[in-house]
């Protein structure tokens, strides 16, 4: 029986050009985590295999950093990064647990400030 639960950061926001840590935590189970997959809609961002290390998809390689831990750091954020992210925990013997994070990338406060006080 699968007793575990995934705790995530839930809905988060970050500024355009900044970075964010996507983090999930599996609790309430003694199952062994063999791998964590990070996905965005139908796109694979990265895989962290407990034994084999990290794989990062080439389309994200220049702005995704592994960690901390089983998490993922997404850098140089753009508005297009807004959306759902999933952490998929492969465990033994339980099976698969999935967590969801919604990221909203906002225009930076500097940009907003500049727009509000623009000289005509």
């Amino acid at each position: 029986m699968m007793t575990g639960t995934i705790e995530t950061t839930g809905n988060i926001s970050a500024e355009k050009g900044g970075s964010i840590i996507l983090q999930c935590h599996l609790s309430s189970t003694t199952a062994q985590v063999t791998q964590v997959n990070w996905e965005q809609q139908d796109q694979l961002l990265a895989i962290c295999n407990a034994d084999l290390g990290w794989h990062i998809s080439p389309s994200f390689k220049d702005r995704v950093a592994p960690g901390p831990g089983l998490g993922l750091t997404l850098q140089s954020l753009t508005v297009n990064d807004t959306g759902e992210y999933f952490c998929i925990y492969h465990t033994y013997p339980d099976g698969t647990y999935t967590g969801r994070i919604f990221l909203e990338v906002l225009e930076s406060s500097v940009a907003e400030h500049g727009a509000r006080f623009q000289i005509p």
């Epitope: 996905e39 694979l44 895989i47 034994d51 990062i56 998809s57 492969h90």
Partner: antibody, heavy 119, light 107 residues
């Protein structure tokens, strides 16, 4: 240029063991996980397992877990695969292979080691 | 284990033709798929990864596409030197698995 140099062909008797080596040159050995792949004559490829020299972690295909042992010698940048209790089904070419920076795809391959199990 | 099925064991084609090889995964593998070429008597060689990126030095006549469970490898204009066996490979979850291979024969 990255090169994986494997040991030569082996003729072994049923029930015996074999240990194949794979020496890496042209890159930092500890940065990349080394994998082993089996190819029986005229057949497809079968992943045996991989070893991460950085943390010592190993991942095995369950089909080989009881009989295969993957090890490394960091000082000589050499990976080893030992296969025990050999039968004729183990007669095959064995390849060492590894990926590139943060990529699991097998970008580099050894030349293969032919293992023949025969009485 | 995830089974990678290459429906055609053999494909016959002529020089200059366009040929596509398909690979179907028994379970979802996202984009964690690569394609390899193995010529007679040689080690496999990485052509395509993730699953539409050409590896360094691979001619642009080789392309790949797909996501989820269905993947396609295409040679836009077959050359005589493309005579080989082509394998798909998933590394989404262990044990990593390969397709049975498709042998490309030149007419």
């Amino acid at each position: 240029e990255v090169q994986l140099q494997q040991s030569g062909p082996e003729l072994v008797k049923p029930g015996a063991s074999v240990k194949i080596s794979c020496k890496t040159s042209g890159s930092t050995f500890t940065e990349y996980t080394m994998h082993w792949v089996k190819q029986s004559h005229g057949k497809s490829l079968e992943w045996i397992g991989g070893l991460n020299p950085n943390n010592g972690g190993t991942s095995y295909n369950q089909r080989f877990k009881d009989r295969a042992t993957l090890t490394v010698d960091k000082s000589s940048s050499t990976a080893y695969m030992e296969l025990r209790s050999l039968t004729s089904e183990d007669s095959a070419v064995y390849y060492c292979t590894r990926g590139t920076y943060y990529d699991y795809s097998f970008a580099y391959w050894g030349q293969g080691t032919l293992v023949t199990v025969s009485a | 284990d995830i089974v990678m099925t290459q429906s055609h064991k053999f494909m016959s084609t002529s020089v200059g033709d366009r040929v596509s090889i398909t690979c179907k995964a028994s379970h979802y593998v996202s984009t964690a798929v690569a394609w390899y070429q193995q010529k007679p008597g040689q080690s496999p060689k990485l052509l395509i990864y993730s699953p539409s990126y050409r590896y360094t030095g691979v001619p642009d006549r080789f392309t790949g596409s797909g996501s989820g469970t269905d993947f396609t490898f295409t040679i836009s204009s077959v050359q005589a030197e493309d005579l080989a066996v082509y394998y798909c490979h998933q590394h989404y979850s262990t044990p990593w698995t390969f397709g049975g291979g498709t042998k490309l024969e030149i007419k």
